[in-house]
Interface confidence: medium
């Protein structure tokens, strides 16, 4: 049965899923602030563009009895069962802001009608691509595998002036949720990454892990991991590493690395770190004040979920079109819009572009510093240090094969 | 579809506590979801509280968070509402729902009883 949407006359309401399994270990409190603060940015825009609606958000709580770890992998159908039943029996809203778990948002939108937008502060995995009335507002496992794909074919930079063809990715499986599905992207035998390499294998042990940093065999010398340096240490230890091995440390939703007291730790010296460009307003935020930086971007991915909405209320109504309409569901993508922290760019499939950044420790300072940008957007690398001052040797990246270039 | 009968509504002072039951006919009662729904007079309906088939996954409308526990006891039929912390507002009739695992919607519904919290 169609789903009665609160969405017109005036008043327009933003259903907010508060489910106990949740990308990242955020309290529900924080989550919360997030979104009022975004409301309150919300009113005052339509406010200032002479637009008299209410604008309000309704949130539906569970209490995690089945998702007491937090951990999206629990997350059942069962429970998406009772969500939807939920939404029939009362008036869903203009917009679903929700889940942020890759298996259940697949879910969800497996089994719900395409008459209203859901926007999700994560959804990561490749099952959730090209879904047409869906958005993601933090990077997509899809957007890491083509910057990948780029930086390995890229040769003619100062500093790598050698294709790479081959890779290890080493994954355990205890990963957090966004990088659970960014490596099983990677892994994927069907997949834009797999497809452009010549060899790739995954590292599941941490003994396999350790043992190919100085082993003389090896077919890569290139490995992929995800997580922050803490992880990195648990891992490696102080181990002698190959003089030509480069560990890809993806730890996207980090902004730690651009702290101004930060010094980079001897075992980071063969590693290149990715992460975002951070934002600048962010540190003084009632609503992230007490964030950590990687929570600081999930309570953010929802508070821009409510300026998102607000941005195509604003657009609809001075058009004078119905909320209610396919249209409105599927007009949450190609454009941009005034985010929180500065513009934001969502690509034709509704999902978040961003300035990815590649970060290595300079020998010299023992800080972390940007070797090149990249724009997920129009999928284009920009070098920044030209002479980077590298533990490679000619601070060069050495060739991903053993036994050429570099050693 | 299943029969479900509501019981435990009444009277009671602000603060108070009151425990509603909803029990359903049918063997298969583990199979369906169910959810408690309240109605204020001159006002839509509300949705209160719901529980999955097996009780793994429990919901709660804001207004009631912290206040209300719902529960289920599949040996017997029955769902509860246990409702602690009572305020003015929440005088309503109170519905119980039902639907099973697979639809989209609640498509059994009891007739209601009565809550009145007074100040």
């Known amino acids: 049965s169609q789903v009665s949407q609160n969405c017109h006359n005036g008043s327009y309401e933003i259903s907010v899923l508060m489910m106990g399994n949740s990308a990242f270990a955020e309290p529900l409190k924080n989550l919360e602030d997030a979104v009022n603060e975004g409301l309150e940015i919300v009113r005052g825009r339509l406010q200032n563009a002479g637009l008299n609606v209410t604008v309000n958000a309704t949130f539906m709580y569970s209490d995690g009895l089945i998702h007491n770890s937090g951990d999206c992998r629990s997350s059942t159908c069962e429970g998406l069962d009772l969500l939807r039943k939920i939404s029939n029996a009362q008036r869903m809203g203009c917009v679903l802001i929700g889940p942020s778990c890759t298996y259940s948002t697949f879910q969800m939108y497996l089994d719900t009608e395409l008459s209203y937008p859901m926007i999700s502060a994560g959804s990561f995995g490749l099952s959730c691509d090209y879904k047409e009335t869906l958005t993601r507002l933090m990077s997509p496992a899809r957007k890491l595998m083509y910057f990948l794909v780029n930086f390995w074919k890229t040769n003619d930079l100062p500093f790598k002036t050698y294709s790479w063809s081959t890779s290890y990715v080493y994954k355990n499986g205890t990963e957090t949720e966004d990088c659970f599905w960014y490596l099983n992207a990677l892994e994927a035998s069907v997949s834009y990454f797999s497809h452009e390499l010549g060899f790739k294998v995954v590292l599941r042990q941490d003994k396999e892990f350790q043992d190919i940093l100085m082993d003389h065999n090896r077919k890569s010398n290139v490995i992929i991991m995800c997580g922050g340096p803490e992880f990195l240490y648990k891992l490696k230890g102080d181990r002698a590493v190959a003089e030509d091995i480069v560990i890809i440390l993806v730890d996207l939703f980090n902004d730690q690395y651009f702290e101004d007291n930060v010094t980079a730790p001897d075992y980071m010296k063969n590693v290149l770190v990715l992460t975002l460009s951070p934002g600048n307003s962010l540190l003084n935020s009632s609503f992230s004040r007490n964030l950590s930086p990687t929570k600081r971007d999930f309570a953010l991915a929802y508070l821009n979920g409510i300026l998102l909405f607000g941005h195509m209320l604003k657009i609809f109504l001075e058009n004078g079109e119905n909320i209610t309409t396919p249209k409105f569901a599927h007009a949450f993508r190609n454009l941009t819009f005034e985010g929180y922290d500065g513009p934001v760019t969502l690509d034709d499939w509704g999902d978040v572009d961003s300035t990815m950044v590649l970060l290595y420790t300079s020998v010299d300072t023992k800080k972390y510093k940007v070797l090149l940008t990249y724009d997920t957007h129009v999928n284009k690398t920009y070098p920044v240090d030209m002479s980077p001052t590298f533990t490679w040797k000619n601070s060069k990246l050495p060739n991903d094969i053993t036994g050429r270039g570099p050693q | 579809q299943v029969q479900l009968q509501e019981s435990g509504g009444g009277l009671v002072q602000a603060g108070g506590s009151l425990r509603l039951s909803c029990a359903a006919s049918g063997r298969t009662f583990s199979s369906y979801a169910m959810g408690w729904f309240r109605q204020a007079p001159g006002k839509e309906r509300e949705f209160v509280a719901a529980i999955s088939g097996s009780g793994g996954s429990i919901y709660y409308g804001d207004s009631v968070k912290g206040r209300f526990t719902i529960s289920r006891d599949n040996a017997k039929n029955t769902m509860y509402l246990q409702m602690n912390r009572l305020k003015p507002e929440d005088t309503a009739v109170y519905y119980c729902?039902?639907?099973?695992?697979?639809?989209?919607?609640?498509?059994?519904w009891g007739q209601g009883t009565q809550v009145t919290v007074s100040s």
């Open positions: 729902a039902a639907g099973p695992l697979g639809s989209p919607d609640f498509d059994s």
